[in-house]
C-alpha cells in the first residue's frame, strides 16, 4: 500500500517559482518523508540544504519551493524517500535551466535490458564550441564544434543496467547551470520479464505502465490504475487509487509526475512536453500522449481516458462486448467509527463492475499493516468484505483505509477509528442486608476506569465453589435487591459496566463475597424430654419423613443451666429418640433439636428437664391451711425445683388417735400446690403432715400442723389461693 509520488513543477527552471512536492498517498509513513539532493546522480551540484515544508493541502506530503530569485541554485538531481515497515522507496528527478544550450527529449527514459537506445538532446543554442556529454557527472563523450548536430545522441545498441544514470549535455565552455539532464532507467530484465533471474513473464501493463522487475507488478502512469493499469482515473486525478487530485485550473497541466523506478517521470495523461504543458494531439492520449486511440466502432477519443466506449462495449479499443466496467465505489462507510477495545469486525462494502472479489479488497491499518478479509460475500450489486481484528486497542486509533483494486480501477476510503477503553468499576459492590433468600446490594458502579458514557450496568452473581455460570441482572439504580438466592450459601458478586457500541461490555470489577442466612427443614415434631436417671435424660420425637432424597440427621444440642457445659449430638434420621447421658444429678438441662441435610434446619423451641436427684427431697415449704369449714379445709404448699419430686403425700388423723388410724392422700402431680381435704368431722382437731417424695425417698417433716374444723353452721375461714385438687 506504499504509493509515493514526486511532482516536479517545473523541471525547466526560468525566472518563475518552481517546486518539488512529495506525496505519500493512501498510507501513513512511519518516518517523515524526506526530500534531498541526489549526489549519487550528480556529485558536483549545489550544496545548500533544502528548505522542506509540510504541504498544507495534503495530509502526508512535503514540499520544497524555490522563489524566482533562487533560480541559479536549483540545477541538479533530487530525490524523495518514504519508509514504511522497514521498506524504503526512493523517487528521483532533476531540474535544469530553461536557458540551457541543450534540452533533453524526455526527463527520464525507461528501457529494457538489451534494448537499442538513443538518448537524445535537442540543440537550442548554437555555439562555436565542442559539445560534451557526461554520465553521473563524469565525462563520457565529446563532439567537435563543427560536428554538433541539431539532435545530440548517445547511442547504446544493447543497453545494460550499468548504463543507467543521469546523462547531461552542454558546450565545453558551459557548466552545471547550462547543462541539460536526462535520466536513463534500464530495467534489470529484458522486455516482458521479471524476477531475480529475469525468467518470469510480466503481466501486460497497459497504458504505458511499467512492469517492476523485482515483483512483476505494474507501476501505473498518473491517470491510470488497477492491476494492469487498464482503468482510466476520473478527470484530473492520479495516484494508485486515483484519489489524489490536481488542483490547477487546467488539471494536471505543468505537473511532471515521477514514480518509483523503473517508471521514472512522465506527464499526467492528456499532457506532453518537457514541462507537461502541451495538450495531446487528436487521436492520442495517455502520459506524454504516447498512446494512440484505435477505437473500434468510431467512438470518441478522449485525451485523458482514451476510447469512450458506447454502452455494451469495453476494452482499450472498445473491442469487447459486455457490461462496461465500472470503477469500484466504497459505500456505507462512515467517516468516523467509535470502537470498543477487543474484537472488531470492520466491514468494507463496495460496488462496481466486475464486482470486487475478496482478494481485491483490503484494509490498511494506520501503521501500514494490510489486512485481508476473513469473510466475504456478495449480492447482485455489492461485495462485502468482513475483516477480523482479534484485539483492537487504543493505540490502533487513527486513519484506517478501505482499499478496493479491480480491473475496473481502484478506490480507497480513509475513515477514522477511535478505540475506547472498556469501563471497569474500581470498587467491589457492598452488601447492605441479607436474608436466607435475598440480599440488598449497593453496586458501587462509580468511580470506574476506562471510557464512558455507561449505557447499562449488570450485577453478576454466583455461588462460590459452584461450577455454574455467572448469573446477571440489569441494574438501573445503585441499590438493588437480589432475590431467589439459596439459604446459607456463600455468593460472589461483581459489577460489569457496558458502554455504547458493539462489544461494549467491560471487564467485571472487583469481587465481593457474602453468605445468605440459613433456612432448612422444620424441627422434629412431638419432642419430649424426660429424666431417665441421675445422669441421663431421654429425648423422643415423632418419626421424620423427609420430602427430598437428601440424607438427613437430627442434631440435638443440650446445655446445662447451672454450668457452662454444652454438647451437640448427631442422631441418624431414622431414629426417634436419644439418651442424653454423662449428666450431673439434680441438674437442669436445656435441650433443642433440628433436622439437617446439606443445609441446616430450623431449631426447635427449648425443652428443659432435670436429672433425677441423688438426695432426699426437702420438705414442702410455705404450708398453709385455709378455707376451713365444718367438713373441709384447703392445704397449700410450695416445693423446690430440682429434686425430682414426683409426688406429694398429705397425712392426717384425728388428734389423739393412734398412728395407724391416719389417712394418706398421695398427689402424683408435683405441679399441684394445694389440696382440699373433705369429709372431716365438725368441731374436730386434726394433725396434718405433708411430705415430698422423689426417686430417693420421702422428706422428713420437722413438725405437724393442726387443723380444727368449724361447727356445722359457721362460715368458712381463711380463703387461700393456688392450684386446688378437688
Amino acid at each position: 500500500a506504499m504509493d509515493l509520488i514526486l511532482i516536479n513543477s517545473l523541471p525547466l527552471v526560468s525566472d518563475a517559482e518552481t517546486s518539488l512536492t512529495c506525496i505519500a498517498s493512501g498510507w501513513r509513513p512511519h518516518e517523515p518523508i524526506t526530500i534531498g539532493r541526489d549526489f549519487e546522480a550528480l556529485m558536483n551540484q549545489h550544496q545548500d540544504p533544502l528548505e522542506v515544508t509540510q504541504d498544507v493541502t495534503r495530509e502526508w506530503a512535503k514540499k520544497v519551493v524555490w522563489k524566482r530569485e533562487k533560480a541559479s541554485k536549483i540545477n541538479g538531481a533530487y530525490f524523495c524517500e518514504g519508509r514504511v515497515r522497514g521498506e524504503a522507496i526512493r523517487i528521483r528527478t532533476m531540474k535544469m535551466r530553461q536557458q540551457a544550450s541543450f534540452l533533453p527529449a524526455t526527463l527520464t527514459m525507461t528501457v529494457d535490458k538489451g534494448d537499442n537506445v538513443n538518448i537524445s538532446f535537442k540543440k537550442v543554442l548554437i555555439k562555436e564550441e565542442d559539445a560534451v556529454i557526461y554520465k553521473n557527472g563524469s565525462f563520457i563523450h565529446s563532439v567537435p564544434r563543427h560536428e554538433v548536430p541539431d539532435i545530440l545522441e548517445v547511442h547504446l545498441p544493447h543497453a545494460q543496467p550499468q548504463d543507467a544514470g543521469v546523462y547531461s549535455a552542454r558546450y565545453i565552455g558551459g557548466n552545471l547551470f547550462t547543462s541539460a539532464f536526462t535520466r536513463l532507467i534500464v530495467r534489470r530484465c529484458e522486455a516482458q520479464k521479471w524476477g531475480p533471474e529475469c525468467n518470469h513473464l510480466c503481466t501486460a501493463c497497459m497504458n504505458n505502465g511499467v512492469c517492476h522487475e523485482d515483483t512483476g507488478e505494474c507501476i501505473c502512469p498518473p491517470g491510470f490504475m488497477g492491476r494492469t493499469c487498464e482503468k482510466a482515473c476520473e478527470l484530473h486525478t492520479f495516484g494508485r487509487t486515483c484519489k489524489e487530485r490536481c488542483s490547477g485550473q487546467e488539471g494536471c497541466k505543468s505537473y511532471v509526475f515521477c514514480l518509483p523506478d523503473p517508471y521514472g517521470c512522465s506527464c499526467a495523461t492528456g499532457w506532453k512536453g518537457l514541462q507537461c504543458n502541451e495538450a495531446c494531439h487528436p487521436g492520442f492520449y495517455g502520459p506524454d500522449c504516447k498512446l494512440r486511440c484505435s477505437c473500434n466502432n468510431g467512438e470518441m477519443c478522449d485525451r485523458f481516458q482514451g476510447c469512450l466506449c458506447s454502452p455494451g462495449w469495453q476494452g482499450l479499443q472498445c473491442e469487447r462486448e459486455g457490461i462496461p466496467r465500472m470503477t469500484p465505489k466504497i459505500v456505507d462507510l462512515p467517516d468516523h467509527i467509535e470502537v470498543n477495545s477487543g474484537k472488531f469486525n470492520p466491514i468494507c462494502k463496495a460496488s462496481g463492475w466486475p464486482l470486487p472479489t475478496n482478494e481485491e479488497m483490503t484494509l490498511v491499518k494506520p501503521d501500514g499493516t494490510v489486512l485481508h478479509p476473513k469473510d466475504f460475500n456478495h449480492t447482485d450489486h455489492f461485495s462485502v468484505a468482513i475483516f477480523t481484528i482479534h484485539r483492537i486497542l487504543p493505540p490502533d486509533s487513527g486513519v484506517w483505509v478501505c482499499s478496493v483494486n479491480t480491473v475496473a480501477g481502484m478506490v480507497e476510503k480513509p475513515f477514522n477509528i477511535s478505540v475506547k477503553v472498556l469501563p471497569k468499576p474500581l470498587n467491589a459492590p457492598n452488601v447492605i442486608d441479607t436474608g436466607h433468600n435475598f440480599a440488598v446490594i449497593n453496586i458501587s458502579s462509580e468511580p470506574y476506569f476506562g471510557d464512558g458514557p455507561i449505557k447499562s450496568k449488570k450485577l453478576l452473581y454466583k455461588p462460590v465453589n459452584h461450577y455454574e455460570a455467572w448469573q446477571h441482572i440489569q441494574v438501573t439504580n445503585e441499590i438493588v435487591t437480589l432475590n431467589y438466592l439459596e439459604p446459607r450459601t456463600e455468593y460472589e458478586l461483581c459489577v460489569q459496566l457496558v458502554r455504547r457500541g458493539e462489544g461494549g461490555e467491560g471487564h467485571p470489577g472487583p469481587v465481593r463475597r457474602f453468605t445468605t442466612a440459613s433456612i432448612g427443614l422444620p424441627p422434629p415434631r412431638g419432642l419430649n424430654l424426660l429424666p431417665k436417671s441421675q445422669t441421663t435424660l431421654n429425648l423422643t420425637w415423632q418419626p421424620i419423613f423427609p420430602s427430598s432424597e437428601d440424607d438427613f440427621y437430627v442434631e440435638v444440642e443440650r446445655r446445662s443451666v447451672q454450668k457452662s457445659d454444652q454438647q451437640n449430638i448427631k442422631v441418624p434420621g431414622n431414629l426417634t429418640s436419644v439418651l442424653l447421658n454423662n449428666l450431673h444429678p439434680r441438674e437442669q438441662y436445656v435441650v433443642r433439636a433440628r433436622v439437617n441435610t446439606k443445609a441446616q434446619g430450623e431449631w426447635s423451641e427449648d425443652l428443659t428437664a432435670w436429672t433425677l436427684s441423688d438426695i432426699l427431697p426437702p420438705q414442702p415449704e410455705n404450708i398453709k391451711i385455709s378455707n376451713i369449714t365444718h367438713s373441709s379445709a384447703v392445704i397449700s404448699w410450695t416445693i423446690l425445683d430440682g429434686y425430682s419430686i414426683s409426688s406429694i403425700t398429705i397425712r392426717y388423723k384425728v388428734q389423739g388417735k393412734n398412728e395407724d388410724q391416719h389417712v394418706d392422700v398421695k398427689i402424683k402431680n408435683a405441679t399441684i400446690t394445694q389440696y382440699q381435704l373433705k369429709g372431716l368431722e365438725p368441731e374436730t382437731a386434726y394433725q396434718v403432715d405433708i411430705f415430698a417424695e422423689n426417686n430417693i425417698g420421702s422428706s422428713n417433716p420437722a413438725f405437724s400442723h393442726e387443723l380444727v374444723t368449724l361447727p356445722e353452721s359457721q362460715a368458712p375461714a381463711d380463703l387461700g389461693g393456688g392450684k386446688m385438687l378437688l
Epitope: 524476477g195 531475480p196 533471474e197 503481466t203 512483476g216 507488478e217 492491476r227 487498464e230
Partner: antibody, heavy 117, light 113 residues
C-alpha cells in the same frame, strides 16, 4: 468472479495426441501470462509450461519440451495445451493457472489425462 | 533448477495444537535488492486444485485465516498453523519463484491425531 474452466481430458494411448483447453472469465485474459501445472496420481505438483500475455514468449519444463505446445487465443479468452507423443508418465491431473507475481493465484478445476494402452 | 524439499512427509497433530511444516531450497530464494523471499505456500484438499496461502514467504493471501503464518529466509522456511482445525486437513506444498522453472516441494500430508 474470476474463473478458469477446463475441458479436453480423457484416456489416450501412448504416442497419441490430446488437446486441453482452459476458458477464462472475470478477468482481462489478454493481460495475464498463463501456466499449466500437472499432478501425477498420488504425487506432488509439477510445472509444465507458461505463455506470456501476448503469446510471444513460451517456456516449457524439460520433461515436455518438443512434445507439448502452449498457445492462447485472446479474442476467445482461451488457453490451450497441445500434447503430442504422449507417454504413460504424462498421466496426471492438469491444471491451468493465473499468476500473482510468481505465485499461482487462480486455478482451474483440473482435468484428468490417462495415457494407457 | 532449484530443488525444494519439505519435511516431514506427513504429520499428525491434535485439534487445537500447533502444526509446523518445513521447506528447504537447494539455493537461496532471498533477493538481496529488495530483501524479499520468492516463496509461496499452497494447501490442497482431496479432489481440489491447490489454494494459494502465502506469497513472499510471509504475506498471507486474502481470505486465508490468520492461524496460518509463514516465516524463514534464504533457504529455510516454515509454515505454521497456530491452532489446527478440522478443515486444515490437506496436503501442503511450498513453491519457489526466484528462478524459472518454478518448482514445488514434494508435499506434506497433515492429518488429525
Amino acid at each position: 468472479q474470476v474463473q478458469l474452466v477446463q475441458s479436453g481430458g480423457g484416456v489416450v494411448q501412448p504416442g497419441r495426441s490430446l488437446r486441453l483447453s482452459c476458458a477464462a472469465s472475470g478477468l482481462t485474459f489478454s493481460n495475464y501470462a498463463m501456466h499449466w501445472v500437472r499432478q501425477a496420481p498420488g504425487k506432488g505438483l509439477e510445472w509444465v509450461a507458461v505463455i506470456s500475455y501476448d503469446g510471444e514468449n513460451k517456456y516449457y519444463a524439460d520433461s515436455v519440451k518438443g512434445r507439448f505446445t502452449i498457445s492462447r487465443d485472446n479474442s476467445k479468452n482461451m488457453l490451450q495445451l497441445q500434447m503430442n507423443r504422449l507417454r504413460s508418465e504424462d498421466t496426471a491431473v492438469y491444471y491451468c493457472a493465473t499468476p500473482k507475481g510468481g505465485a499461482l493465484e487462480i486455478w482451474g478445476q483440473g482435468t484428468v489425462i490417462t495415457v494407457s494402452s | 533448477d532449484i530443488q525444494m524439499t519439505q519435511s516431514p512427509d506427513s504429520l499428525a497433530v491434535s485439534l487445537g495444537e500447533r502444526a509446523t511444516i518445513n521447506c528447504k531450497s537447494s539455493a537461496s530464494v532471498l533477493y538481496s535488492s529488495n530483501n524479499k523471499n520468492y516463496l509461496a505456500w499452497y494447501q490442497q484438499k482431496p479432489g481440489q486444485p491447490p489454494n494459494l496461502l502465502m506469497y513472499w514467504a510471509s504475506t498471507r493471501e486474502s481470505g486465508v485465516p490468520d492461524r496460518f503464518s509463514g516465516s524463514g529466509s534464504g533457504t529455510d522456511f516454515t509454515l505454521t498453523i497456530s491452532s489446527l482445525q478440522a478443515e486444515d486437513v490437506a496436503v501442503y506444498y511450498c513453491q519457489q519463484y526466484y528462478s524459472a522453472p518454478i518448482t514445488f516441494g514434494q508435499g506434506t500430508r497433515l492429518e488429525i491425531k
